[in-house]
């Protein structure tokens, strides 16, 4: 063996966004012939030294990063990637909107905004099917998505979510579900949004930030998160992946 | 695997029900592994009314949460079940089972035992 | 709370038949559901778990299908002791409910 034992892969099926109550299995995924694999929660002492975490009930304190590794013979493998598990319904849901409605012509532009009545800095949009979130962190309780030159890709169910910069693992219940209705188009493109929004006066800082990445990271000017919402595995009590979008830090 | 109940038959109302699910080919100390509470009332259909996990976690139908408890003594294999002030409407046959997380579902039955409530 | 739904309530058919039974939740559980039969004066017995999956000495001709909120559970070429009660369960965040049961009985 030249080199460190390669990362194992950690997913939470059937999501890493877990409503309070509900069941989550975190699992880590080596090669085959493992002597040992360790589960870890970061900031805290919590590990297991098995594959799988199994959580019946999400509870508030179980919000957080989690990575893994195993062990073969004397040799450790480098970390996973860190696996975030989201824990929502914390907080009463958002509400989403469109401006300047629901319906908007292909090529035509359209502005989602989630709004909610708590003083939450951060907000997540999510559309169902697509493979990474947006997050955006606003001053005035209202997150603006912009969607410039919009194509048939970008219909859709959209909802929202919001949550504090100082506890981010702990979001709000999902906005009811916005349904964006591209009208005058046939052609559908595979991936979307098809360009970054260009900035906004009114929030540009934080729509200046927004990148959207096909992969299940999401980067910043400032920082790189990864939000993964986990496939469906076959042989697993798991479900169609839900997929994220987030803007900003 | 095997799981058998025990309880007392016939009860008269306001009584407290006990009931002790005994089982053997696993241990309830296991990770992942938990046992549950259904009924069934003649002819009707299947009612959950709590389980209790290898941690010690425990769940109730929110309906009967203040009269239930739910208890584990591990090194003797058993669980129990309390039902507090039965009446009529509790006569059916109870069944205890074992979960696994894994498959989430339970996977292995008791042949359930009968209450009847009655004055 | 989740609320199942189970359909026929009854159903009659023959031996060789195949017959399919519907299970839908009033939300999203993923996969989180089982499958039952019961015979008469007999505790229920596992058939299908996490939606799809076969349990322990389970004849192939059972299947289970579905994800999210519409489930069913097929029987190809019915069997005499086949018949009986089913029920679905879900398994998502207590309290778990079942369906309320579908009588399968001999035509």
């Known amino acids: 063996q030249s080199g460190p034992l390669p990362k194992p892969s950690l997913q939470a099926l059937p999501s890493s966004l877990v409503p309070l109550e509900k069941p989550v299995t975190l699992r880590c995924q080596g090669p085959p012939g493992v002597d040992l694999y360790r589960l870890e929660k970061l900031s805290s002492s919590r590990y297991q030294d098995q594959a799988v975490l199994f959580i019946p009930a999400m509870k508030r304190s179980l919000a957080g990063r989690y990575r893994c590794s195993y062990q073969n013979g004397s040799l450790w493998s480098l970390p996973s990637d860190q696996l975030e598990l989201v824990a929502t319904g914390v907080f009463a849901k958002p509400s989403l909107s469109a401006q300047p409605g629901p319906a908007v012509s292909s090529g035509g532009d359209v502005t989602l905004q989630c709004q909610t009545r708590y003083g939450f800095d951060q907000f997540a949009l999510y559309k169902e099917g697509d493979p990474a979130p947006y997050k955006n962190p606003e001053r005035w309780y209202r997150a603006s998505f912009p969607i410039i030159t919009v194509t048939a890709a970008h219909s859709g169910t959209y909802r929202c979510y919001s949550f504090s910069s100082r506890d981010p693992y702990l979001w709000s219940a999902p906005s009811d579900p916005l349904e964006l209705v591209v009208t005058g188009t046939s052609v559908t493109p595979s991936r979307l949004p098809t360009e970054p929004p260009s900035p906004v006066a009114e929030f540009s800082e934080a729509t200046a930030e927004l990148t959207v990445s096909f992969t299940n990271e999401v980067f910043t000017t400032e920082t790189s998160r990864s939000i993964t919402a986990s496939p469906k595995e076959s042989d697993s009590p798991a479900g169609p992946a839900r997929q994220y979008y987030t803007k900003g830090n | 695997v095997t799981l058998k109940e025990s309880g007392p038959g016939i009860l008269q109302p306001s009584q407290t029900l006990s009931l002790t699910c005994s089982f053997s080919?696993?241990?309830?100390?296991?990770?992942?592994?938990?046992v549950g509470w259904i009924r069934q009332p003649s002819g009707k259909g299947l009612e959950w009314l709590a389980h209790?996990?290898?941690?010690?976690?425990?769940y109730y139908n929110t309906a009967l949460k203040s009269r239930l408890t739910i208890s584990k003594d591990t090194s003797n294999n058993q669980v129990f079940l309390k039902i507090a002030s039965v009446d009529t409407a509790d006569t059916a046959t109870y069944y205890c089972?074992?979960?696994?997380?894994?498959?989430?579902?339970?996977?292995?039955w008791g042949q359930g035992t009968t209450l009847t409530v009655s004055s | 709370d989740i609320q199942m739904t189970q359909s026929p309530a009854s159903l009659s058919a023959s031996v060789g038949e195949t017959v399919t039974i519907t299970c839908r939740a009033s939300e999203n559980i993923y996969s989180y559901l089982a499958w039952y039969q019961q015979k008469q004066g007999k505790s229920p017995h596992l058939l299908v778990y996490a939606a799809t999956n076969l349990a322990d000495g389970v004849p192939s001709r059972f299947s289970g299908s579905g994800s999210g909120t519409q489930f069913s559970l097929k029987i190809n070429s019915l069997q005499p002791e086949d018949f009986g009660s089913y029920y679905c369960?879900?398994?998502?965040?207590?309290?778990?409910?079942f369906g309320g049961g579908t009588k399968l009985e001999i035509k």
């Open positions: 369960q879900h398994f998502y965040g207590t309290p778990w409910t």
């Open positions: 080919g696993f241990s309830l100390s296991t990770y992942g592994i938990g």
């Open positions: 209790i996990w290898w941690d010690d976690n425990k």
């Open positions: 089972a074992r979960i696994h997380y894994y498959g989430s579902s339970l996977d292995y």
